[in-house]
């Protein structure tokens, strides 16, 4: 026996109070799939969140963050403060990277400079708070067509909780 609710399309719900007929989702709610017995309340993008896509009867609102903040988490569940390049976000706010570390983005943590000597390479360009060290080629690598720079260290995810 077919469930009568399976005929209810997205944007509606199967109304048990009305003999399982399909009723439209009311304003500020949605159902993104057919056959739903309730409509979900739309997400409200308030405060530091900004509306990227409005809610409709068939899809939830999508939020991003106001300028000076960036999204964290699935579906932008949190907004975290931006810092300048050369800084990282701590519990006390944005702090400059310690000597020997760098951050070339507005988010994330400071990462150690690449250690050129571990790869047997000379330092071609010193690192700064906002830029990694650039390693030169190994003396034996100075052949035509060889790459003369080492890619920067891989990025790590922030290791602290968002404010």
């Amino acid at each position: 026996l077919q469930d009568p609710c399976s005929n209810c399309p997205a944007g509606t719900f199967c109304d048990n109070n009305r003999n399982q007929i399909c009723s439209p989702c009311p304003p500020n709610s949605f159902s993104s799939a057919g056959g739903q017995r309730t409509c979900d309340i739309c997400r409200q993008c308030k405060g530091v969140f900004r509306t990227r896509k409005e809610c409709s009867s068939t899809s939830n609102a999508e939020c991003d963050c106001t300028p000076g903040f960036h999204c964290l988490g699935a579906g932008c569940s949190m907004c975290e403060q931006d810092c300048k390049q050369g800084q990282e976000l701590t519990k006390k706010g944005c702090k400059d990277c310690c000597f020997g570390t760098f951050n070339d983005q507005k988010r994330g943590i400071c990462r150690p400079w690449t250690n050129c000597s571990l790869a047997g390479k000379p330092v071609l360009m010193n690192g700064t708070k906002a830029r990694d060290v650039v390693c030169g080629p190994r003396p034996a690598d100075l052949s035509p067509g060889a790459s003369s720079v080492t890619p920067p260290a891989p990025a790590r995810e922030p290791g602290h909780s968002p404010q």
Partner: antibody, heavy 117, light 112 residues
Framework: QSVEESGGRLVTPGTPLTLTCTVS????????MIWVRQAPGKGLEWIGV?????YISHATWVKGRFTISKTSTTVGLEITSPTTEDTATYFC??????????????WGQGTLVTVSS | DIVMTQTPASVEAAVGGTVTIKCQAS??????LAWYQQKPGQPPKLLIY???TLASGVSSRFKGSGSGTEFTLTISDLESADAATYYC??????????????FGGGTEVVVK
């Protein structure tokens, strides 16, 4: 894409009247439609809306004086028991998108309803 | 219900001048506000939506601003073709009263 109102005429008080908004070039299952009226020399007054999913909402002041309906290509507005205060040009308009908080960017030319004994 | 209060009811300005129209909502509507222009015998024409975004084909002389409960429409370098009545409208669907498409009372702009 267009919307066109029809059905406006001279009616006597208490005689029900149904206005029709006929759309072409787009689907009513994608857009919301509103009814708005304008009495001679007065401002715009929102009557009600029918959303893409069929949900209908009336302005609070309507209190049963108007009934909105929808088919696949038309939106209806019934003036259930017209009074002389309902004399106005009635407009229907299409939303810009299918969201709940939408705005209206495609308007018909309006249809004139005159209620007089 | 959300009530939209528009001021002034009428304003007169010379060609080349600037006109400012204000619209106040009885409760916060975020940036869910549209402005329309209406000339006699014509339907309203959308000018601005989301409080400050210019509708397609509308001159940049029209500028909308504000959020929450206070909104402004500014028309600069006024032209004779700008003579019309201007309306604000909330498009905040989901107020506590589920009554979110109210218009302001209108402002007649007279261009000298």
């Amino acid at each position: 894409q267009s919307v066109e109102e029809s059905g406006g005429r001279l009616v006597t008080p208490g005689t029900p009247l149904t206005l029709t908004c006929t759309v072409s070039g787009f689907s009513l299952s994608t857009y919301a439609m509103i009814w708005v009226r304008q009495a001679p020399g007065k401002g715009l007054e929102w009557i009600g809306v029918v959303y893409d999913n069929g949900y209908i909402s009336h302005a609070t002041w309507v209190k049963g004086r108007f009934t909105i309906s929808k088919t696949s290509t038309t939106v209806g507005l019934e003036i259930t028991s017209p009074t002389t205060e309902d004399t106005a040009t009635y407009f229907c308009a299409r939303s810009a998108d299918g969201s709940w908080s939408t705005y209206f960017n495609l308007w018909g030319q309006g249809t004139l309803v005159t209620v007089s004994s | 219900d959300i009530v939209m209060t528009q001021t002034p009811a009428s304003v007169e300005a010379a060609v080349g001048g600037t006109v400012t129209i204000k619209c106040q909502a009885s409760e916060s509507i975020s940036n869910y506000l549209a402005w329309y222009q209406q000339k006699p015998g014509q339907p309203p024409k959308l000018l601005i939506y989301k409080a400050s975004t210019l509708a397609s084909g509308v001159s940049s002389r029209f500028k909308g601003s504000g959020s929450g409960t206070e909104f402004t429409l500014t028309i600069s370098d006024l032209e004779s073709a700008d003579a019309a009545t201007y309306y604000c409208q909330t498009n905040y669907c989901c107020s506590s009263s589920d009554n979110g498409f109210a218009f302001g009372g209108g402002t007649e702009v007279v261009v000298k």
